[in-house]
């Protein structure tokens, strides 16, 4: 059985109000007034189950209840609730009608009874304007008398003694002679307590935390010299004496330098001066996580809310009787606990606003053996938001497809656990992928054709009703190529330019009324499309940068069929860069010299339009450069023995040199000197 | 959306009771009033009276006052409507509708009770 | 309690035309909130009354805005702007500023 603690409305004020000072009950309205601006209506009862009107919720959030002139049918105890969207707040105080000629019954309560400190008794008279009259049993005459002074009195007992205790009652009069009566309050007992109120108790971080982590409990009272004793479910565990040195509040902190497992329970604490105690503090639940599976949190109807509606987090756990406890990202304590039979608990947020929005996570833990926790829950998103986030459409791997190949379009955004909507334009009917807890909607489209090419955006699709607003996504442009002849793509002034410079890629077509596109490999997306006049497009590039290096292709397509592209070009490679990457180096046929015969060596760069210079331990050789970097090596006299390298220059570019190739070693044949022989 | 669905038609004797369920469904069931509304054949609407399940408060109108009970459970989203004392005038389609302070908004679809001996 | 009283009990109506019908109360229905607890349902044959207007001259979800309430203290009047088949069936007035609510006898709206 789930025992609900759901954070309750807070109660109404309930009041009455007359047109006839000197007798009231001529005329009577009581009002009912919500401190929350969420509330819709009122409801008025009698006797705690008579239903006698409900009332919507005025600008003011309140509700006037008008019951004219009183008769012995009015005559029972009325409270008020305040009446939200899906909650009922806790009752006001009961206000006690008792005759058809007499004000309404006051309510006396009073702070602490401590010996020697002032004390407080509070008269509510529910009128505005009335005098009010505080008695002692025993004694005749009044004890103290105020005069009008709003709806309710407060009157002091100075030092509280011995002499003090004894039943009170408090009675409100008509402000004018001759005074007209209320029935005396229900009565009130003091007794003088040998207790201090209990002290202020908190744990400076959250009081839910995982192995290894720095706890401090503080107990704080605004009692001066004072000793704290800390509590672990009902028991000792620690004291501090009480210190002369600062005036004012007491204070003690209690540290647990590195929380243990078996640290977790509800820890209490209390302060002594001599004789006189404390009550108890309100206990602090330390809850130790980790040592069981992590629950799921799951909200409903769905994590996006409508600013004053209501949602329901579902923490699904794993063991049964457990408590649950809902957190969120940045309050210090966790905003609500349930126990449950079950192994899950539902935790209502009702009529949120903005501040709701956030990060929400849970735990449950066991309450017999130390509070020992689960892990954290992953954290759920909440949006309170009259408008959904957009989301963003991508294609993967590109929105620029070849005819046959597979693409995923991914409609993803911030919002989890909500379903998506894939809409092509130009067609009536969407496709719907209804979310997971992923908080992305893959749309796969597998053996593409020239049906799928297009215009799309997404947008999300909750899956139940909602009045929160839907925006749609970017729009994507999903190309099918390889149903043209490719173009080609050339790089101006050439392929590899310096940083900061200027570069062109020219993208040239066989057909007019042409569309081009610009491609990077890894890029999901064009990078740039042109409708030039002729049959090119010129992409320029501006100050180029390091990460504009990369492999370039282009496609096109014609005005007529819009999205079916044309073939790749060939790739282009790009360099931006001050020193153009090292060329490598090889020998044909071999780096070994044989008798008579000559060795080419081959330096390849990646670039077109250079020129190649070779080395021989670390000089010019003779034959020093070539265009396409073959280099005949020969060894006459050994001279060809040694280390090689080769480097290359950009023709447009003549002064920057490339970094050197590693060496290439050539040798000559091993054995001995081969000797010429004449057969004679 | 809202339903109430209400249980079926029943034939009483007289000076029997009837009880009549109404059964909530795809909306929240505690937040709202539950009234009932009878009418005889041929004639027009009278409110009896009306509960607040999550409050257990109830309003009878005065001339079903002691022969009419209005009970909810919420566990079960159900409210009920039992009238004791039955007599052949007390013949009419009884519906339950939802309300609050903007008038009954979504009703049953009505439970015949014939009084007949 | 509080007396509603209808006119006219029948009403035949030709479709495109207007239509109104009168509700006269006992004792006013203007509550000291400014609100005038009158709300107005319609009957089709054979089915459950629906609500057609609430606290005097709010329209109920999804009700068409041919129809229009209004009023004061004690005298109230629904119009139908422009009559159309599916409005017929019967029409009643109720008081909600206190228990118990009490209807009107009902109008029975017909075509001609």
């Known amino acids: 059985e789930e025992t609900e603690i759901v954070m309750p409305t807070p109660k109404p004020e309930l009041w009455a109000e007359t047109n006839f000072p000197l007798a009231p009950w001529k005329n009577l309205t009581l009002w009912c007034r919500s401190p929350s601006g969420s509330t819709k209506e009122f409801v008025l009862l009698k006797d705690g189950t008579g239903w006698i009107a409900t009332r919507p919720a005025s600008e003011q959030v309140r509700a006037a209840f008008p019951l004219g002139a009183l008769t012995q049918s009015h005559t029972g105890s009325y409270h008020c609730h305040s009446w939200e969207e899906m909650a009922v707040s806790e009752p006001s105080e009961a206000l006690e009608l008792v005759g058809t000629d007499i004000l309404p019954k006051p309510v006396i309560s009073a702070s602490p009874t401590i010996r020697g400190q002032e004390l407080q008794l509070r008269c509510k008279g529910w009128l505005a304007g009335m005098g009010f009259a505080l008695y002692k049993e025993g004694e005749q005459e009044p004890v103290q008398q105020l005069g009008a002074v709003g709806r309710e009195a407060f009157f002091t007992i100075q030092r509280m003694e011995d002499k003090d205790e004894g039943n009170y009652s408090c009675r409100t009069h008509t402000e004018k002679r001759p005074f007209k009566w209320s029935e005396p309050s229900e009565p009130l007992e003091l007794v003088i307590k040998e207790m201090y109120p209990k002290p202020f108790f908190k744990t400076w971080a959250s009081p839910v935390v995982t192995p290894g982590a720095r706890v401090t409990f503080n107990c704080s009272t605004p009692h001066q010299h004072m000793s704290f004793i800390l509590y672990k479910d009902g028991s000792e565990i620690a004291s501090s004496d009480r210190s002369w040195a600062s005036p004012g509040a007491s204070a003690a902190h209690f540290l647990i330098i590195s929380v243990g497992i078996g640290d977790g329970g509800n820890y209490s604490c209390r302060y002594y001066d001599f004789s006189i105690w404390s009550e108890p503090s309100d206990p602090v639940e330390l809850v130790v996580t980790e040592f069981y599976p992590k629950p799921t949190l799951l909200a409903q109807p769905g994590p996006v809310v409508f600013p004053g509606k209501s949602v329901i987090l579902r923490c699904q756990g794993t063991f049964q009787g457990m408590r649950f406890a809902l957190l969120q990202e940045g309050a210090h304590v966790p905003l609500q606990f349930r126990s449950v039979s079950g192994n899950s608990a539902d935790f209502l947020l009702h009529t949120v606003g903005a501040e709701d929005s956030g990060n929400y996570s849970c735990i449950y833990y066991e309450t017999t053996m130390s509070n020992r926790g689960s892990y954290l829950s992953m954290p759920l998103m909440i949006w309170v938001t009259d408008t959904f986030p957009k989301p963003w459409l991508f294609a993967e791997p590109s929105s620029v497809v070849p005819m046959g190949q597979n693409v995923t379009l991914w409609c993803r955004g911030p919002v989890h656990g909500v379903g998506y909507i894939l809409h092509k334009e130009g067609e009536a009917t969407s496709m719907q992928l209804w979310g997971s807890t992923s908080n992305d909607g893959a749309f796969p489209i597998t053996n593409i054709s020239g049906t799928s090419m297009g215009r799309y955006s997404c947008c999300y699709h909750p899956d139940w009703t909602s009045s929160i607003k839907i925006q749609p996504s970017n729009t994507l442009e999903l190309l099918v190529t390889g149903l043209l002849p490719k173009p080609s793509l050339l790089a101006q002034p050439g392929p590899m330019v310096a940083p900061g410079e200027n570069m062109t890629l020219q993208c040239q077509g066989e057909l007019p009324d042409s569309t081009f596109v610009l491609l990077k490999e890894g890029a999901q997306e064009p990078l740039e499309q042109q409708r030039p006049s002729g049959y090119r497009a010129d992409f320029w590039m501006p100050a180029v940068r390091g990460e504009d290096s990369g492999i370039y292709s282009c496609v096109y397509y014609l005005d007529s069929t819009p999205f079916a592209a044309s073939n790749h070009s060939d790739s282009l490679e790009i360099w931006v860069t001050d020193k153009p990457p090292k060329p490598s180096l090889s020998a044909w046929p071999s780096t070994m010299f044989k008798l008579g015969k000559d060795i080419t060596l081959q330096c390849r760069g990646p670039l077109p339009g250079v020129e190649f210079v070779l080395e021989h331990d670390g000089e010019e050789a003779p034959q020093q450069f070539s265009e396409d970097g073959d280099f005949v090596i020969n060894n006459v006299e050994g001279k060809g023995i040694g280390n090689y390298s080769c480097s290359y220059r950009l023709q447009a570019y003549p002064d920057i040199w490339s970094e050197p190739s590693d060496p290439l070693e050539l040798v000559g044949a091993a054995g001995p000197v081969a000797q010429e022989c004449t057969v004679g | 959306q809202m339903q109430l669905v209400q249980s079926g038609a029943e034939v009483k004797k007289p000076g029997s009771s009837v009880k009549v369920s109404c059964k909530a469904s795809?909306?929240?069931?505690?937040?709202?009033?539950i009234s009932w509304v009878r009418q005889a054949p041929g004639q027009g609407l009278e409110w009896m009276g009306g509960?607040?399940?999550?409050?257990?408060?109830?309003n009878y109108a005065q001339r079903f006052q002691g022969r009419v009970t209005m009970t909810a459970d919420e566990s079960t989203t159900t409210a009920y409507m039992e009238l004791s004392g039955l007599r052949s005038e007390d013949t009419a389609v009884y519906y339950c509708?939802?309300?609050?302070?903007?008038?009954?908004?979504?009703w049953g679809h009505g439970t015949l009770i014939t009084v007949s001996s | 309690d509080i007396v509603m009283t209808q006119t006219p009990l029948s009403l035949p109506v030709t479709p495109g035309q207007p239509a109104s019908i009168s509700c006269k109360s006992s004792?006013?229905?203007?509550?000291?909130?400014?609100?005038?607890?009158l709300d107005w349902y319609l009957q089709k044959p054979g089915q459950s009354p629906q609500l057609l207007i609430y606290?005097?001259?709010h329209r109920a979800s999804g009700v068409p805005d041919r129809f229009s309430g209004s009023g004061s203290g004690t005298d109230f009047t629904l119009k139908i702007s422009r009559v159309e088949a599916d409005d017929v069936g019967l029409y009643y007035c109720?008081?909600?500023?206190?228990?118990?609510?009490?209807f009107g006898q009902g109008t029975k709206v017909e075509i001609k």
């Open positions: 509708a939802r309300g609050r302070s903007w008038g009954f908004d979504y």
């Open positions: 795809g909306g929240t069931f505690s937040s709202y009033a």
């Open positions: 509960i607040i399940p999550v409050l257990g408060a109830t």
């Open positions: 004792q006013s229905l203007l509550h000291s909130d400014g609100n005038t607890y």
């Open positions: 606290t005097l001259s």
């Open positions: 109720m008081q909600r500023i206190e228990f118990p609510y009490t």
